[in-house]
C-alpha cells in the first residue's frame, strides 16, 4: 500500500557547535489538524527515537522541555533542528509523520537524512 510521501534531504552537515537542521515535508492525503512528527535514528539495524512532537496545524511544534529537538511548522513542512550533537551521533535520522486527527490515520516515513557531525578541534592555549 502506497504510504504517505515524506521528503527530507539526503545529507546534512552539523555545525561546529553540534547543531543540524533539515526540512521534513509530507504530502497530506487528508485534511489533518493534528500531526505528530517523530525523529528516529537508525544505526546499523537498531532504531531509536530521538524526539517527537504533536502539533495542531498552524501552531508551533512543542517538544518536551528536555528534548534535543526544536522545530517550526509551515503548512505541510516541518523545519527540524537537532542540538547537542557529537561525532558519535553521526547517523541516519528518519522523519516519521503521522496524521492523527481527524481520521483517517495516515503514516509516512522519509528515507532518512544522513547527519555528519565532526567534533571541533580543541583550541590551543595562547600566550599573550
Amino acid at each position: 500500500c502506497k504510504a504517505m510521501h515524506v521528503a527530507q534531504p539526503a545529507v546534512v552537515l552539523a555545525s561546529s557547535r553540534g547543531i543540524a537542521s533539515f526540512v521534513c515535508e509530507y504530502a497530506s492525503p487528508g485534511k489533518a489538524t493534528e500531526v505528530r512528527v517523530t525523529v528516529l535514528r537508525q544505526a546499523d539495524s537498531q532504531v531509536t527515537e530521538v524526539c517527537a512532537a504533536t502539533y495542531m496545524m498552524g501552531n508551533e511544534l512543542t517538544f518536551l522541555d528536555d528534548s534535543i529537538c526544536t522545530g517550526t511548522s509551515s503548512g505541510n513542512q516541518v523545519n527540524l533542528t537537532i542540538q547537542g550533537l557529537r561525532a558519535m551521533d553521526t547517523g541516519l535520522y528518519i522523519c516519521k509523520v503521522e496524521l492523527m486527527y481527524p481520521p483517517p490515520y495516515y503514516l509516512g516515513i522519509g528515507n532518512g537524512t544522513q547527519i555528519y557531525v565532526i567534533d571541533p578541534e580543541p583550541c590551543p592555549d595562547s600566550d599573550f
Epitope: C1, P29, I94, P103, P104, Y105, I109
Partner: antibody, heavy 116, light 106 residues
C-alpha cells in the same frame, strides 16, 4: 453510525468470475480508502488492495493483481471487487474495510465458495 | 514483502492476568504497525494503530509498544471478553499480517 454492508454469500464454479459489493454509509465516502482483505479457512489475513473513492486511485498486493479488480460507484457509495478465473484457492471470506493506514471499520465479510 | 511473525500462536491465561503477544518484522518498519482483535464469528476490529495508539472505543487495558523490528501487545487484567484472535499488521510497502494469536481463558 458507520456501516459497511457486504453482499451475500456466493457459490461459483471453477474458472468463473464473481463481483462482490460493499455498501458504505454513516460517513463521507470519499474521505476514506476502501480496503479488501481475504480470510481463508484456518489461515491468516491477506491484504488484497485498496481503492480511494476521492480520486479513483487504487493499489494492489502484487499477489492479487491478476486476480482482483477494485472499483467504486460514488453516487451509491458502494465499492466492488471482481475476482476472476476462480479456483478452490479463492474460497474464502472477503472483507471490505474503510481506512487510511489503519482499517477502523470492517464489513461482516462475504463468503465465496468455489466448487463444481 | 515484509514477513510478520507472531508469537505465541495460542495462549491460555486466567482472568486478571497480564499477557503479552509479540510480533516480529523481517525488517525495520519504524512503528508502522497495527493490531486487530477478531472475536469468534465477528469481523476484525482495530485495536492499536501506529504501534502505540489505542483505537477509539477500545479498553485502556490494551497497550502497544515497540520500534524497529519487535512489537508487543500487552493486555492487562485479562477479562473473559478478551477471548479472541489477535493479528499484527505491517503498513509499510505491501501490507502484511502476522499469523495470529488465539487467546483463551483458563
Amino acid at each position: 453510525e458507520v456501516q459497511l454492508q457486504p453482499s451475500g454469500p456466493v457459490l461459483v464454479k471453477p474458472g468463473a468470475s464473481v463481483k462482490i459489493s460493499c455498501k458504505a454509509s454513516g460517513y463521507t465516502f470519499t474521505d476514506y480508502k476502501i480496503h479488501w482483505v481475504k480470510q481463508s479457512h484456518g489461515k491468516s489475513l491477506e491484504w488484497i488492495g485498496y481503492i480511494y473513492p476521492y480520486s479513483g486511485s487504487s493499489d494492489y498486493n502484487q499477489k492479487f493483481k491478476s486476480k482482483a479488480t477494485l472499483t467504486v460507484d460514488n453516487s451509491s457509495t458502494t465499492a466492488y471487487m471482481e475476482l476472476r478465473s476462480l479456483t478452490s484457492e479463492d474460497s474464502a471470506v472477503y472483507y471490505c474495510a474503510r481506512g487510511g493506514d489503519a482499517m477502523d471499520y470492517w464489513g461482516q465479510g462475504t463468503a465465496v465458495t468455489v466448487s463444481s | 514483502d515484509i514477513l510478520m511473525t507472531q508469537s505465541p500462536a495460542s495462549l491460555s491465561a486466567s482472568v486478571g492476568e497480564t499477557v503479552t503477544i509479540t510480533c516480529g518484522a523481517s525488517e525495520n518498519i519504524y512503528g508502522a504497525l497495527n493490531w486487530y482483535q477478531r472475536k469468534q464469528g465477528k469481523s476484525p476490529q482495530l485495536l492499536i494503530y501506529g504501534a502505540t495508539n489505542l483505537a477509539d472505543g477500545m479498553s485502556s487495558r490494551f497497550s502497544g509498544s515497540g520500534l524497529g523490528r519487535q512489537y508487543y501487545l500487552k493486555i492487562s487484567s485479562l477479562h473473559p471478553d478478551d477471548v479472541a484472535t489477535y493479528f499484527c499488521q505491517n503498513i509499510l510497502g505491501t501490507w502484511t499480517f502476522g499469523g495470529g494469536t488465539k487467546l483463551e481463558i483458563k
